[in-house]
Amino acid sequence: AWELTILHTNDVHSRLEQTSEDSSKCVNASRCMGGVARLFTKVQQIRRAEPNVLLLDAGDQYQGTIWFTVYKGAEVAHFMNALRYDAMALGNHEFDNGVEGLIEPLLKEAKFPILSANIKAKGPLASQISGLYLPYKVLPVGDEVVGIVGYTSKETPFLSNPGTNLVFEDEITALQPEVDKLKTLNVNKIIALGHSGFEMDKLIAQKVRGVDVVVGGHSNTFLYTGNPPSKEVPAGKYPFIVTSDDGRKVPVVQAYAFGKYLGYLKIEFDERGNVISSHGNPILLNSSIPEDPSIKADINKWRIKLDNYSTQELGKTIVYLDGSSQSCRFRECNMGNLICDAMINNNLRHTDEMFWNHVSMCILNGGGIRSPIDERNNGTITWENLAAVLPFGGTFDLVQLKGSTLKKAFEHSVHRYGQSTGEFLQVGGIHVVYDLSRKPGDRVVKLDVLCTKCRVPSYDPLKMDEVYKVILPNFLANGGDGFQMIKDELLRHDSGDQDINVVSTYISKMKVIYPAVEGRIKFSTGSH
């Protein structure tokens, strides 16, 4: 028997520095977690103690904090190289700055293979990107070899900016021939490493013949055996065992997100490459694990540029950006409109001639808008200003909801109107009319939504049984501010970009902004 230790991360999302327990900015260092310096300490400890160790990342290193905004992926390559990652799979967010924003900072600089079997380049890009990412890689580990085959969510064109010269194929269809190829090369231990979410990870384990282990990402799935060490609630045991169609027991793992845990899986193979046993658990990277001093020093050196960036002008406003709770929790506010417009703009993807865009709607809890921005400061808007408006370090995510769920969400928005509560929704691509004289739960009298399958966008009444795409804060997608119906009834949820980054990019693009209050939210009284 031969034992392999797989260390794995996924969805780190730019958390190079240690964070608080909820993966936001570290405030009290004695209670902070994660970060590459602490991760390195643990990885090195395991490398010293165990013979056959692989360190793998299942994608979405890009996007999530000011580190990515400023360094644009150079920080990912630098610190992953420093940690000596053995392989990485491409995630959807690796394409956030287009293909060039992947090639130059990461693909050309990484000293480890970057993988995806289901992304095929065409046209002029094919030769430019050739060899910079691979469908699979055979890695020597001790006296043996291990094949790593990569995959990426085929929804990436809807979630990021891969351009028109990359084709995202069905994961299972694309993986099978690559695994077969590895078999012909006498590689009998194969790990599928990828970024398509836990449901697809399980399907790959079930359907792709020859895959021994699946290491996944995208869905931020936390798996654990026994009593979990922090706040995350396990979606199942670690590893999650799937019985494949050909009768094998295939371990599937994922390690939550944000570098909070290091996935730790021990696999025992027989001489023919069959998995005999698998066990392990994610390791919580809490303050009991010291940060490596040399990596920490490097982080501090890179940090200097971030502090300078946060006071630079991103763009100008020529109007007062009303982010006051007196406005945003009671009526349409222009800060809410600005943020929603930025959220939609960040999700412009012309992937189908029938649609001007795949999504037209945004909702945003008024309580998430924490500050106004005064235009009488020469109109200057900085990252620092935006951090006061959006201080929670969330993301703006893409969900699919039924019309009936949206209607219920808008009822919740005003169910206790007048108490300055945070659930009052700001909107984009939506016209809503409330009648507060009606009973709570029955106050939405008109709800019109901007069409997507149209060449000239116009507002049409919501249909209860239709499925709609909506951009919203991850806080709402997770049921925050009492929006349990969104969490319970959503049909799909994909994590998006860092909230401040979305708004800052929009302001930089527009250069001068002047958002208005324009009748997106109205109040009426009378018969309907």
């Epitope: 009936s404 009444p461 209860m464």
Partner: antibody, heavy 120, light 107 residues
């Protein structure tokens, strides 16, 4: 006020096509958000939703009967039609049309119903 | 498709009594439920929507409740005009199916 009234052949033979008309007033299907459904009720039995048409000509059908149903509308004359092909005795029922706004899921206004008997 | 199962199929009760009719969905319908009353030879009339909101003109002795797959309609202090057949209907997704009905007679 809102009123709906169904009309049909009363009696027809198996294998024929049933044509029903719903004439309504008090609202218009040219108004965004309006819709009309057909629902039937065999004598002494429960209600079965058949089909729905939205203001924008979007249609919904009960999957168990979809191949036999066609719903349509004439906006200018305030009418909605339902055709059921290849009828047999199991299609004997009172047929109702009902109004349903797109923002609601319920039927707030119903017609009085028209009895259709399929008999050889 | 979601099936709606009503119980009881029939019941007899006296004026002044309190009765409860239940409706079970074969899947989670997330409170998207309406109740109707139908009198002999008449068309159904909306009583309750969104599980618990009374339609205009419906007396407050009627109340709806429930969540997930289990829902109920309660009538306090039955009045003579309350007798008839009651139907639940879900509108979580098309097809918008009805329950089999509960026939309520005067004892």
């Amino acid at each position: 006020q809102v009123t709906l009234k169904e009309s049909g052949p009363g009696i027809l033979q198996p294998s024929q096509t049933l044509s029903l008309t719903c004439s309504f007033s008090g609202f218009s299907l040219s108004t965004s958000g309006m819709g009309v459904s057909w629902i039937r009720q065999p004598s002494g039995k429960g209600l079965e939703w058949l089909a729905h048409i939205y203001w924008d000509d979007d249609k919904r059908y009960n999957p168990s009967l979809k191949s036999r149903l066609t719903i349509s509308k004439d906006t200018s004359s305030n009418q909605v039609f339902l055709k059921i092909t290849s009828v047999d005795t199991a299609d004997t029922a009172t047929y109702y049309c009902a109004r349903r706004r797109s923002l609601d899921g319920w039927f707030a206004y119903w017609g009085q119903g028209t009895l259709v008997t399929v008999s050889a | 498709d979601i099936q709606m199962t009503q119980s009881p199929a029939a019941l007899s009760a006296s004026v002044g009594e309190t009765v409860t009719i239940t409706c079970r969905a074969s899947g989670n319908i997330h409170n998207y439920l309406a109740w109707y009353q139908q009198k002999q030879g008449k068309s159904p009339q909306l009583l309750v929507y969104n599980t618990q909101i009374l339609a205009d003109g419906v007396p407050s002795r009627f109340s709806g409740s429930g969540s997930g797959t289990q829902y109920s309609l309660k009538i306090n202090s039955l009045q003579p005009e309350d007798f008839g057949t009651f139907y639940c209907q879900h509108f979580w997704d098309s097809p918008w199916t009805f329950g089999g009905g509960t026939k309520m007679e005067i004892k």
